[in-house]
């Protein structure tokens, strides 16, 4: 996911509403102007504000990365809300990244849940009832390029 | 070990079909992506389009959308891409590569050299 | 489509030097940055992912940093095996796209 950062607003434009502060603070889907006198809407798909606040800027909406899926729009009072796509489930260790799960389990082991965006396959042992958490890699990731001569091009 | 045995240089003529090979061993492709890229010569890298193999999805570069249909045989461990109505500037060698993570490739084949030419 | 730009496109350096490889995206893709090394006849290999993490395999010396939209590649101490082409990629949005490659050669 992108980071969320704040948005830099440029000077409100006409069609940006405007209401005054309620004890210094703008209500959700607004920010503080720089004078503290004026309320100023977020911009819908492009910034927001969850709670009541003196924010000079909107924090700026999130993107879902490549590896993700929109479940929900940004809009001006919630931020956008990103998921892993189908197939794949976002790591404990590695919160930023959605990794494949795995398809089958060891050999010895059945299936005991099923992929999902927050987790892994988990898989139990046929004999014991012993839960494999699935988070130990079906494949290797230790980088090399396959043997043999390529017919590549020189760069 | 890991490895992505592609298949042999093609020679082809304009406007006909090529389908190129990347046979998996050392792991279930399932349990990956597959990725294509171009490299024609002497130039950089152009990502095509990539397969998960466990459902069949398929994302392509736009630019290769109509030209290259990526697919997959999961009972052999195989990937496929199949180039269309081929011009000289598909000239060039194809890589199919994987990633346990969508976003980068760790492990490439050994390049197709596919060649354009009437 | 984001546009990777990398610059110099050709940096000459001595072996034991210091080599920095630099990477630009034309709009932000937080640290989806990945850098590869190609040598002449063979498929590029993974040197480093998301940035800055290292890859089991690749030597200590290849180093990179960034976030955002400048990235750089670091080679501390440039031996023989390391002259070759560099390529960053951003995973961050479809399509993918690459940068267009430095030649790294002796000086």
């Known amino acids: 996911i992108t980071q969320q950062d704040l948005a830099p607003q440029q000077r409100a434009a006409p069609q940006q509403k405007r209401s005054s502060p309620s004890e210094g603070l703008c209500p959700p889907g607004h920010h503080i102007s720089e004078d503290g006198r004026d309320c100023i809407s977020c911009k819908y798909g492009q910034d927001y504000s969850t709670h009541w606040n003196d924010l000079l800027f909107c924090l700026r909406c999130t993107r879902c990365d490549s590896g993700e899926v929109e479940l929900s729009p940004c809009t001006t009072t919630r931020n956008t809300v990103c998921q892993c796509e189908e197939g794949t489930f976002r790591e404990e260790d590695s919160p930023e990244m959605c990794r494949k799960c795995r398809t089958g389990c060891p050999r010895g082991m059945v299936k005991l849940t099923s992929c999902t965006p927050r987790e892994n396959r988990k898989c139990v042992s046929k004999t014991s009832g012993t839960k494999h958490s699935g988070e130990v890699p079906a494949v290797e990731e230790t980088v090399t390029s396959s043997p043999g001569t390529p017919a590549s091009p020189c760069s | 070990e890991v490895q992505l045995q592609q298949s042999g240089a093609e020679v082809v003529k304009p406007g006909a079909s090529v389908k190129l090979s990347c046979k998996a061993s050392g792991f279930n492709i399932k349990d990956t992506f597959i990725h294509w890229v171009k490299q024609a010569p002497g130039q950089g890298l152009e990502w095509i389009g990539r397969?998960?193999?466990?459902?069949?999805?398929?994302k392509y570069d736009p630019k290769f959308q109509g030209k290259a249909t990526i697919t997959t045989d999961t009972s052999s461990n195989t990937a496929y891409m199949e180039l269309s109505s081929l011009r000289s500037e598909d000239t060039a060698v194809y890589y199919c590569?994987?990633?346990?993570?969508?976003?980068?490739?760790?492990?490439w084949g050994q390049g197709t050299l596919v060649t354009v030419s009437s | 489509e984001i546009v990777m730009t990398q610059s110099p496109a050709t940096l000459s350096v001595s072996p034991g030097e210091r080599a920095t490889l630099s990477c630009r995206a034309s709009?932000?893709?937080?640290?989806?940055l990945h850098w590869y090394q190609q040598k002449p006849g063979q498929a590029p290999r993974l040197l480093i992912k998301?940035?800055?993490q290292s890859i089991t395999g690749i030597p200590a010396r290849f180093s990179g940093s960034g976030s955002g939209t400048e990235f750089t590649l670091t080679i501390s101490s440039l031996q023989s095996e390391d002259f070759a082409v560099y390529y960053c990629?951003?995973?961050?949005?479809?399509?993918?796209?690459f940068g267009q490659g430095t030649k790294l050669e002796i000086k």
């Open positions: 990629q951003q995973g961050n949005s479809w399509p993918y796209t």
């Open positions: 590569v994987r990633g346990l993570y969508t976003y980068y490739f760790d492990y």
């Open positions: 397969i998960d193999p466990a459902n069949g999805n398929t």
């Open positions: 998301f940035a800055s």
């Open positions: 709009q932000s893709i937080s640290n989806n």
